[in-house]
């Protein structure tokens, strides 16, 4: 019971998450115009990873689009390429988590391939919301630099009667959305890894191995299944012939903790 | 079409306060701000505050203790106040309608005289 | 707040002359999220309120004739009028929509010979 629910809940708080990165990424308040110095603007600035807008007192918002690739700073690209990563990988660990979870019932899918895919899903989420984090964090990097640069030049060369005030970006909406968005990913990932190991059944060697003959010898090895770390082969953890004999542990699944080397 | 009308008291006392309402028609309040400017006689244009669409406002530094601009969507009306007139607040006083975009005032009224004397 | 200077104050031209007025800010009027200038021209004639020629430092108004022409950008900008008739005769004023309070210049006075 506490394993549904620790997985369940980790497929939760890891959808909410995705849901948040999704939107961190298609939102245009990455960066807001710092108003520190000049509350009494008329027009606000705010940029995103895909278009850049201004909003007049008037109601009245314009937002054009980045329209170039190549004239963007690689840090942008860096950022918006690790976004998409986040949300690829969250989507797809959200694929395989709904079919791993214990209560939906899909065919006869064992207990050892569902801890496999709640392992894998948690895998994603965690790397998932890594992503998100580190997107984030870079933009708020750039955005940190680029801060102090543009108060340094504000400070000098302020001669004569005309002053050229720079516009300033500090955090927006957007990095507190994805900060949070990935690290409730990371948490639901790492839920999904907890819910993995009560999933997967022990390793039990039998002396003894019930089966129904079906006319023809066939060898077992004992030790039954062993939930691997992946979707790979492994030879080890594999029956090596199925037969119309099941072994004990096919017949009843016992939810237990495994141990992962 | 557009129009903007003031209406005033005309004349005022020193040290009472001034209400003039601003009518208008062809647009909504609820689409369009609506800004106050006076012209005291001879002398040029001074930007006193506006309302917003939305009901947020913006008023002149040197004015905004003593202002007050408020807006009735549902009659299409929008009402300035201010405190403590003095003689040098003599002036025509006009609103105009905010033009969306770029923040210009493209509609005007005919403006209102408002004259501070005992 | 930002101080708007107009000049000159007035001038007298005759009528086909081509005029050229400037107004000059305490500080830049562009915005550089859209590259925009936030200036707005306005015109007064005697006993009437101002009526709105260029908005966005260069933009003419609908129905404002083709001989007003505003240019200009960041703290210098420049009403000209292309060839100045008889009804042109106003007083000229600039004014700043980017920074509260949208303060307007001292206006430039034009007569017709």
């Known amino acids: 019971m506490a394993v549904t629910a620790c997985q369940g809940l980790g497929f939760v708080v890891s959808l909410i998450g995705i849901a948040g990165i999704i939107a961190a990424t298609c939102m245009d308040q990455w960066s807001t115009q710092d108003l520190y110095n000049n509350p009494v603007t008329a027009v606000f600035n705010y940029q995103g990873l895909w278009r850049s807008c201004v909003r007049e007192s008037s109601g009245f918002t314009e937002c054009r689009g980045y329209f170039t690739l190549l004239g963007l700073p690689a840090m942008l690209q860096a950022v918006r390429a690790l976004m998409i990563v986040g949300i690829v990988l969250g989507a797809i660990g959200l694929l395989v988590s709904i079919f791993a979870l214990k209560c939906i019932r899909i065919g006869s899918m064992e207990d050892s391939a569902k801890a496999n895919m709640t392992l894998t899903s948690g895998i994603m989420f965690i790397v998932s919301g890594l992503c998100a984090i580190a997107g984030v964090s870079v933009f708020a990097n750039m955005l940190v630099t680029n801060f102090w640069m543009s108060t340094a030049n504000m400070y000098t060369g302020m001669g004569g009667m005309v002053q050229t005030v720079q516009t300033r970006y500090t955090f927006g909406a957007a990095l507190f959305v994805g900060w949070v968005a990935g690290g409730l990913t990371l948490i639901g990932g790492v839920m999904m890894c907890i819910a993995c190991r009560g999933l997967a059944p022990e390793e039990t060697n039998y002396k003894a191995v019930s089966y129904h003959a079906s006319g023809h010898s066939v060898a077992y090895k004992p030790g039954g299944f062993k939930a691997s770390t992946g979707f790979g082969s492994n030879t080890k953890n594999k029956k090596i012939y199925d037969g119309g004999a099941r072994t004990e542990d096919e017949v009843q699944s016992y939810p237990s903790k495994h141990d992962y080397v | 079409q557009v129009q903007l009308k003031e209406s005033g008291p005309g004349l005022v006392a020193p040290s009472q306060s001034l209400s003039i309402t601003c009518t208008v028609s062809g647009f909504s309040l609820t689409s369009y701000g609506v800004y106050w400017v006076r012209q005291p006689p001879g002398k040029g244009l001074e930007w006193l505050g506006v309302?917003?669409?939305?009901?947020?406002?913006n008023y002149n530094s040197a004015l905004m203790s003593r202002l007050s601009i408020n807006k009735d969507n549902s009659k299409s009306q929008v009402f300035l106040k201010m405190n403590s007139l003095q003689t040098d607040d003599t002036a025509m006083y006009y609103c105009?309608?905010?033009?969306?975009?770029?923040?210009?005032?493209?509609?005007w009224g005919q403006g209102t005289s408002v004259t501070v004397s005992s | 707040d930002i101080v708007m200077t107009q000049s000159p104050s007035s001038l007298s031209v005759s009528a086909g002359e081509k005029v050229t007025m400037s107004c000059r800010s305490s500080?830049?009027?562009?915005?550089?999220?859209?590259?925009?200038?936030?200036l707005a021209w306005y015109q007064q004639k005697p006993g009437q309120p101002p009526k709105l020629l260029i908005y966005g430092a260069s933009t003419r108004e609908s129905g404002v004739p083709d001989r007003f022409t505003g240019s200009g950008s960041g703290t210098d900008f420049t009403l000209t009028i292309g060839s100045v008739q008889a009804e042109d005769l106003a007083v000229y004023y600039c004014q700043n929509v980017h920074f509260f309070p949208f303060t307007f210049g001292s206006g430039t006075k034009l007569e017709i010979k």
């Open positions: 500080q830049s009027l562009l915005n550089s999220g859209n590259q925009k200038n936030y």
């Open positions: 309302i917003w669409a939305g009901g947020s406002t």
């Open positions: 105009a309608r905010d033009r969306g975009r770029l923040l210009s005032m493209d509609y």
